[in-house]
C-alpha cells in the first residue's frame, strides 16, 4: 500500500470573530483525517501578524494577540496537517478569519411602510408610529435606537419623538400640506460601538379621502390610514 497524506475535511476553513475578542478565545478549528489512521499534528504557517495559535492535537485555533480589523480582513493563514510517525506526510489547507465590527449592522425600518397617508385637508395635526430594527445580536438588552429627522429642511413640517428603544412617532407640525406625496427622511442611530446610523424614508401621501380611504382612480389600491 502507498502511504497517503492526511486529508482535510474542507479546502478552506472560515471563521468570523468580533475584533474585540479576548486574547485566548477560540476563534475556529480545522479537522483532517489520515487514510492510514495515523494520528495527526496540526500547525500554522504564514501567521505573519502573530495573532493565532493552534492546538497540535485537536486543531482548535485560538487568538493570542489583539485583533485589528483595520489591518485587513479576511486574515488568511495556511494550516498544515502532518502524520505522526510513518512518513510524516503532510497536507495544507487554509484558514480564513473574518474580523467583524463590534457593531456591524445599521438600523432600518422593521417593515414596509409604503402606503401611509393622511386625509387632505388635515383638520388637525396628525401622527403615525413606526418601528426600527437591525440585524445585530443584542445579547444582554434589546436595541436602543434614537430617532431624528434626516434633514433640517423637514423640521418646519415634521417632528419625530421616541416612544421606546424600537418605536417612534412621526407627527405633522401644522395642517397646511399640499395634496401630494412627501418623503420624510428619518435618521436612526443604534448607539452601538461604533455607533451606526441608518437613514430611512417614510413616504406619506396627503390625499382626498372617500369613506376613510385614499381616493384613487380605478386600478389603484387603497392606502392604509394612519392618524
Amino acid at each position: 500500500d502507498v502511504n497517503e497524506a492526511p486529508q482535510f475535511s474542507q479546502h478552506v476553513f472560515q471563521a468570523k470573530v468580533s475584533e474585540d475578542v479576548a486574547i485566548g478565545t477560540k476563534v475556529g478549528n480545522v479537522t483532517a483525517k489520515d487514510p492510514e489512521g495515523l494520528d495527526i499534528s496540526y500547525s500554522l504557517r504564514g501567521d505573519t501578524r502573530g495573532w493565532l495559535k493552534i492546538d497540535h492535537v485537536t486543531g482548535e485555533i485560538f487568538s493570542v494577540a489583539p485583533l485589528d480589523r483595520e489591518a485587513g480582513s479576511p486574515y488568511r493563514v495556511q494550516v498544515v496537517a502532518t502524520e505522526v510517525g510513518g512518513s510524516s506526510l503532510s497536507s495544507v489547507s487554509e484558514f480564513h478569519l473574518i474580523l467583524m465590527d463590534v457593531n456591524d449592522n445599521p438600523p432600518r425600518l422593521a417593515k414596509d411602510y409604503t402606503g401611509l397617508f393622511f386625509c387632505h385637508p388635515l383638520s388637525a395635526p396628525g401622527s403615525l408610529i413606526f418601528e426600527a430594527t437591525d440585524d445585530d445580536q443584542h445579547l444582554f438588552r434589546g436595541p436602543h435606537f434614537t430617532f431624528s429627522l434626516g434633514s433640517g429642511s423637514l423640521q418646519n413640517d415634521w417632528e419625530v419623538s421616541k416612544i421606546n428603544g424600537t418605536h417612534a412617532r412621526l407627527s405633522t407640525r401644522h395642517t397646511e400640506f399640499e395634496e401630494r406625496e412627501y418623503v420624510v427622511l428619518i435618521r436612526i442611530n443604534d448607539g452601538g460601538r461604533p455607533p451606526l446610523e441608518g437613514i430611512v424614508s417614510l413616504p406619506v401621501t396627503f390625499c382626498s379621502c372617500v369613506e376613510g380611504s385614499c381616493f384613487r382612480p380605478a386600478g389603484h389600491k387603497h392606502h392604509h390610514h394612519h392618524h
Partner: antibody
Framework: QVQLVQSGAEVKKPGASVKVSCKAS????????MNWVRQAPGQGLEWMGA????????NYAQKFQGRVTMTRDTSTSTVYMELSSLRSEDTAVYYC????????????WGQGTLVTVSS | DIVMTQSPDSLAVSLGERATINCKSS????????????LAWYQQKPGQSPKPLIY???TRESGVPDRFSGSGSGTDFTLTISSLQAEDVAVYYC?????????FGGGTKVEIK
C-alpha cells in the same frame, strides 16, 4: 450548472425602496458568499456588499451603509438586496454574483436587474 | 479601501495582435500567509453580465481560452490577450479580493483597430 436568476426591472420614485431577488441553483446555497455589484449606465462596476448565506453575516461597502440590507431565504435558495431612500444616481443594473471556490472573487453572475429611479 | 487603477482606459488592437491591460493596486495583494495574489480579471461584453477570466492573478477560470493570461504580483498586474479575436471586444475589469471591501478598477475598453 450554477444559475443565478434575478427578478425583473423596476421603476421607482426618489425616496422609495427597491428589493431585488436572486435565486440560486446548481450548488449548495450555504457554501458560497453572495455579492451584489451595481453598474450605472456607461459606468464601471461597484461592489455594494455581500452576505454569507450560512449564517446571514453581511459586509457592506461604507458608501451603502444605512441604505442597503441583504437577506437570504435558505428554503428557496434566494438572496435579496434592498436599497432604500433611492435617488436618481441609484439608477443602475444590479447584479448578484456568487463567490468562487475557496475564496472571494466573483465566479458566477446573475443576468442583472435594471432599477430606474425617476420622478 | 484598496484603490485599483487600470490603464489604458481604451485600447485598439489589430486582429491577431497582442493586447495588454495593466492594473495597479494601492496595497500589496500578495498574502504572506498563503503566498497568493488576490486579484481577478473579468470580461464584460456589451449588454451582458461580467464573466470571470482569471483569479489569484494567474489562474484561468475553466472554459476560458488560453490566449488570456494573467501575470504580476504585489501591486502590479497584467492581463494579456496573446492573439486578439473579434469576440474579445469588450470592457475588462480587474478586482482585488484580498481585503474587504472588494474593489474594481475603472475598466479598459478593447476594440479592433
Amino acid at each position: 450548472q450554477v444559475q443565478l436568476v434575478q427578478s425583473g426591472a423596476e421603476v421607482k420614485k426618489p425616496g422609495a425602496s427597491v428589493k431585488v431577488s436572486c435565486k440560486a441553483s446548481g450548488y449548495t446555497f450555504t457554501d458560497y458568499w453572495m455579492n451584489w455589484v451595481r453598474q450605472a449606465p456607461g459606468q464601471g462596476l461597484e461592489w455594494m456588499g455581500a452576505i454569507d448565506p450560512s449564517d446571514r453575516y453581511t459586509n457592506y461597502a461604507q458608501k451603502f451603509q444605512g441604505r442597503v440590507t441583504m437577506t437570504r431565504d435558505t428554503s428557496t435558495s434566494t438572496v435579496y438586496m434592498e436599497l432604500s431612500s433611492l435617488r436618481s444616481e441609484d439608477t443602475a443594473v444590479y447584479y448578484c454574483a456568487r463567490g468562487g471556490y475557496g475564496d472571494y472573487w466573483f465566479a458566477n453572475w446573475g443576468q442583472g436587474t435594471l432599477v430606474t429611479v425617476s420622478s | 479601501d484598496i484603490v485599483m487603477t487600470q490603464s489604458p482606459d481604451s485600447l485598439a488592437v489589430s486582429l491577431g495582435e497582442r493586447a495588454t491591460i495593466n492594473c495597479k493596486s494601492s496595497q500589496n495583494l500578495l498574502s504572506s500567509g498563503t503566498q497568493k495574489n488576490y486579484l481577478a480579471w473579468y470580461q464584460q461584453k456589451p449588454g451582458q453580465s461580467p464573466k470571470p477570466l482569471i483569479y489569484f492573478a494567474s489562474t484561468r477560470e475553466s472554459g476560458v481560452p488560453d490566449r488570456f493570461s494573467g501575470s504580476g504580483s504585489g501591486t502590479d498586474f497584467t492581463l494579456t490577450i496573446s492573439s486578439l479575436q473579434a469576440e474579445d471586444v469588450a470592457v475588462y475589469y480587474c478586482q482585488q479580493h484580498h481585503y474587504f471591501p472588494w474593489t474594481f478598477g475603472g475598466g479598459t475598453k478593447v476594440e479592433i483597430k
